[in-house]
């Protein structure tokens, strides 16, 4: 069963996914897709990284964390009810059948009528829970069970990132962005550097 995350219509949703690079800058390709993780790749790919950079993304999907340190958690901007469903994070570790697959279920609730929103509400309200058990089903489907161990310092750091998410929003298209500018555009919603 998938680990469940919640967000309200109009919020940004946060889906956590992490790995530990073998060495700084020694990155592993990662893909995010809509739909449960298939045997290869990520179903309908919405974002991917290669060994160096984010080389493909679609509108509203981006990485807020430091993906160069293995934080490949997905942010979905301004969610609607149509964003509900299962998402796949796949860590494409080279070798023979080495991929790590995580299925995450996003539940979108209708927006509540509330006073002016606080900064905290940019992401799903609570820090997402994490599992520490490792699961291996017959179909190799794993939920968040295979995440690397995360220590309290990392959790604190990530919690700060969540709290400062509006600042991160403001920064993401500045010099600190990890989105980059595309070599070309397929259309207004898709941006990628070719993977060769």
């Amino acid at each position: 069963s998938e680990v469940e995350y919640r967000a309200e219509v109009g919020q940004n949703a946060y889906l956590p996914c992490f790995y530990t690079p073998a060495a700084p800058g020694n990155l592993v390709p990662v893909c995010w897709g809509k739909g449960a993780c298939p045997v290869f790749e990520c179903g309908n790919v919405v974002l991917r990284t290669d060994e160096r950079d984010v080389n493909y993304w679609t509108s509203r999907y981006w990485l807020n964390g430091d993906f160069r340190k293995g934080d490949v958690s997905l942010t979905i901007e301004n969610v609607t009810l149509a964003d509900s469903g299962i998402y796949c994070c796949r860590i494409q570790i080279p070798g023979i059948m080495n991929d790590e697959k995580f299925n995450l279920k996003l539940v979108i609730k209708p927006a509540k009528v509330t006073p002016a929103p606080t900064r905290q509400r940019d992401f799903t309200a609570a820090f997402p829970r994490m599992l520490t058990t490792r699961g291996h089903g017959p179909a190799e489907t794993q939920t968040l069970g295979s995440l690397p161990d995360i220590n309290l310092t990392q959790i604190s750091t990530l919690a700060n990132e969540l709290r400062d998410s509006r600042l991160a929003n403001d920064l993401r298209d500045s010099g600190a962005t990890i989105r980059g500018s595309s070599d070309y555009k397929d259309d207004d919603d898709k941006h990628h550097h070719h993977h060769h």
Partner: antibody, heavy 122, light 107 residues
Framework: EVQLVESGGGLVQPGGSLRLSCAAS????????MAWVRQAPGKGLEWVAN????????YYLDSLKSRFTISRDNAKNSLYLQMNSLRAEDTAVYYC???????????????WGQGTLVTVSS | DIQMTQSPSSLSASVGDRVTITCRAS??????LAWYQQKPGKAPKLLIY???TLAEGVPSRFSGSGSGTDFTLTISSLQPEDFATYYC?????????FGQGTKLEIK
């Protein structure tokens, strides 16, 4: 037009080796996972192996991974299957097939070669 | 491994008939299912992918449905060229697995 053309099949003795090749054309080869699927005479289809775009990740039927190696050469638009320690039960037509592309979405073997027959017999 | 079970194993039908072949997965495979047609001495041909999407160039009399564990391939009005063997195949778990095949013969 997408074309996949296998070669390298033939008669080999048990314990022997063969290297199958698949020449691809009509599409950007490096944008797709590729696969080998086999079919023993009069039997159904059996997946053998898959390889990702650049060859860094491979996937095998468990019972074959110690004897078979899938590889690719994107510069030559070619896919390979090295088969060692061949057994009579490896006798089959071996097909090269194009699998999922770089942006996902289409999960099925959309294009197949004509197949090459491997016969393992003494 | 995920087992794929097709039924029936064989069936006889006439031109113009509506035919349904079913495929059951031993585990949830969501919609990662493909259907293939194979004629003697030929390579398989993709008919349907992602459980219900018609592959390029495939006539609209073919359709697929289902998700999770139960899937169907329907041929709305059999044509002479449709007599062949049909296979389902899952793309969800490793190893990729095929059904045992359904041989569609002329009555």
């Amino acid at each position: 037009e997408v074309q996949l053309v296998e070669s390298g099949g033939g008669l080999v003795q048990p314990g022997g080796s063969l290297r199958l090749s698949c020449a691809a054309s009509g599409f950007t080869f490096s944008d797709y996972y590729m696969a080998w699927v086999r079919q023993a005479p009069g039997k159904g289809l059996e997946w053998v192996a898959n390889i990702n775009y650049d060859g860094s990740s491979t996937y095998y039927l468990d019972s074959l991974k110690s004897r078979f190696t899938i590889s690719r050469d994107n510069a030559k638009n070619s896919l390979y299957l090295q088969m060692n320690s061949l057994r009579a039960e490896d006798t089959a037509v071996y097909y090269c097939a194009r699998d999922v592309g770089y942006y996902g979405g289409n999960y099925g073997f959309a294009y197949w070669g004509q197949g090459t027959l491997v016969t393992v017999s003494s | 491994d995920i087992q794929m079970t097709q039924s029936p194993s064989s069936l006889s039908a006439s031109v113009g008939d509506r035919v349904t072949i079913t495929c059951r997965a031993s585990d949830n495979i969501y919609s990662y299912l493909a259907w293939y047609q194979q004629k003697p001495g030929k390579a398989p041909k993709l008919l349907i992918y992602n459980a219900k999407t018609l592959a390029e160039g495939v006539p609209s009399r073919f359709s697929g449905s289902g998700s999770g564990t139960d899937f169907t391939l329907t041929i709305s009005s059999l044509q002479p060229e449709d007599f062949a063997t049909y296979y389902c195949q899952q793309h969800y778990g490793s190893p990729l697995t095929f059904g045992q095949g359904t041989k569609l013969e002329i009555k």
